[in-house]
Interface confidence: low
Amino acid sequence: FKIEISPEYKTIAQIGDSMALTCSTTGCESPLFSWRTQIDSPLNAKVRTEGSKSVLTMEPVSFENEHSYLCTATCGSGKLERSIHVDIYSFPKDPEIQFSGPLEVGKPVTVKCLAPDIYPVYRLEIDLFKGDQLMNRQEFSSEEMTKSLETKSLEVTFTPVIEDIGKALVCRAKLHIDQIDSTLKERETVKELQVYISPRNTTISVHPSTRLQEGGAVTMTCSSEGLPAPEIFWGRKLDNEVLQLLSGNATLTLIAMRMEDSGVYVCEGVNLIGRDKAEVELVVQEKPFIVDISPGSQVAAQVGDSVVLTCAAIGCDSPSFSWRTQTDSPLNGVVRNEGAKSTLVLSSVGFEDEHSYLCAVTCLQRTLEKRTQVEVYSFPEDPVIKMSGPLVHGRPVTVNCTVPNVYPFDHLEIELLKGETTLMKKYFLEEMGIKSLETKILETTFIPTIEDTGKSLVCLARLHSGEMESEPKQRQSVQPLYVNVAPKETTIWVSPSPILEEGSPVNLTCSSDGIPAPKILWSRQLNNGELQPLSENTTLTFMSTKRDDSGIYVCEGINEAGISRKSVELIIQVSPKDIQLTVFPSKSVKEGDTVIISCTCGNVPETWIILKKKAKTGDMVLKSVDGSYTIRQAQLQDAGIYECESKTEVGSQLRSLTLDVKGKEHNKDYFSPE
């Protein structure tokens, strides 16, 4: 029979693996098998025999299995033996690549290539490549032979450069045992180089500026170079140098900035191997927003008018408004806010609305207040000019200038001008008590002259509404002056003469100077002194005069300024007729009687009759009353011839009678000598 062993002669097994040796016979039906080592040490294996085949299994393979194994087959009396040598090795894993730290450009790093659990070490070789470049190689042939598993390493120190990015680091381990098939005797590990760059060149760009206004916005962008690309972190330096983290984005946008947002902002670029930071200081300045009140810092409002106060915030996007009075009295108006404007409407203003109104505008937690003074006034009508009478040249006249319903009258000034000349000016500065409407009067007296005609009387009322008002409110009334001149130099012309013969015509013409031109009024003066109007014509004409037309005729020149009167006596002369001389009780009387001698003439006045008593010594004119002469107690010497003569420029008549007076004792007549 024959014996075979498999594998033949020599085999190699990896520690820890399973290894089977098979011994088989041919030409023997039921052989007996036995196994032993050449030096009779323990088998350290299991035997399983089945028919003509016996299998020695080493599981797991260990150092104790490194022997020559002998298989003996007995068939009957025949015995055959075969041996096989078992070599062991250990090369279980790919090498490991280790770094002393991250691969940072420019910083030396140590690379270690480890071959773990190697046996036999003296046959080990380790190569380290960077890309195609062999960096280091080591053979461990000089190592002492020991029956143990060892880990061997190869170290290289190099300084990474940017060009190393993407290159491969190859660690290759070889175990030089001839029987090992090629896939087992060489192992390698490939590691792509992860090269790092610590953050650097960290820069901040700020838009629009590092100096900002309240309420504004700023965008700060941070960039930092490095590998891997640095992560960006934003923070703000607090007083104690502690950094307050704000954001993890490259861009930091701050909106609606306040002054307290001023400070140092820090941007930090961070990656696995380092950090780099940059700082910027932001200065948030207060936004110079302005509060404007219109119509102005002082508003004059007429009683009953509507006042609209507008408060505007200029340079503030979203202001908040509030209105109050300086004395915090109730606000009588309606407030309406719209965007950057607020209006306070005071409808039908009265004295109670006279205040300082304050508009407070809050913008970004900052408040500005602006004031306007509402001054209520009443000045509804033009002044009224009244005069005590018509204007007469040379005659004093009192002028009243009345300004009705004024408030506040302690700011009132009334001026009265004649042409360009101020006649009087009055300031009403007395203390005001309760607020009320008052009527104020300026009164003055002046003497008009004819030269004032054509000029005007101007009453100028000024209401000074407040200290800040440049121009006072002004009202005026103008009254043209027309100065009257009282009639004067009234003259009467009588044509042909004031003494006329009855039946003659006569014209009485009157003229009078004055302004306006006087109206002429002819009148006749009656016996009781009253005037009887006759005509308003300049000329009074008598076509045929009668004795009754004789008398005093009065011409009056009349205008608004007065009356000028002139009179003329018209004498209508007649030739005396029908003269009668009578005595009462008779022509012959007793001594002591009362005697009345009367002379009448039908067509002439009694005043034109002369009574005389004839005597040797000359005629004696008697004092007659209405043509009558009364002797109270007749005396003897009253006896005589009495003569009555009626005489005019145009003729005369004479009558006479003899009075006889009888004596009481002698009872004889007494005749005056004649």
Epitope: Q285, P288, K370, R371
Partner: nanobody
Framework: QVQLQESGGGLVQPGGSLRLSCAAS????????MSWVRQAPGKGLEWVSG????????YYADSVKGRFTISRDNAKNTLYLQMNSLKSEDTALYYC??????????????????KGQGTQVTVSS
């Protein structure tokens, strides 16, 4: 804490000069408009003068224009008011205040707008 400390006031004859100073602390002085205001006896506050953050723009009330000069030194956190040709009407307590001012009610009616204790200026013969 915002603090403003005025100094430099005193008694001066009409036509004389004074220089007021205001030392500021507790805030970024260079970021603020500043003003001088005054209060005459028995009267309200009156704005006198204002200056912008870097001193390039100055503002004056009509009553002091041509006589007073406002200036600032941001490095020293100090505001100044040079007062020349002083008149008796300039007698008042002078304050420095933050804020742009421009009229009596712009700045000093709100607590947000701090002002100092004041320095007395008396103009009298």
């Amino acid at each position: 804490q915002v603090q403003l400390q005025e100094s430099g006031g005193g008694l001066v004859q009409p036509g004389g000069s004074l220089r007021l100073s205001c030392a500021a602390s507790g805030f970024t002085f260079s970021s603020y408009y500043m003003s001088w205001v005054r209060q005459a006896p028995g009267k309200g506050l009156e704005w006198v003068s204002g200056i912008n953050v870097d001193g390039s723009n100055t503002y004056y009330a009509d009553s002091v224009k041509g006589r007073f000069t406002i200036s600032r030194d941001n490095a020293k956190n100090t505001l100044y008011l040079q007062m020349n040709s002083l008149k008796s009407e300039d007698t008042a307590l002078y304050y420095c205040a933050t804020g742009s001012g421009r009229d009596s009610y712009d700045c000093y009616s709100g607590s947000w707008c701090p002002k100092g204790q004041g320095t007395q200026v008396t103009v009298s013969s």
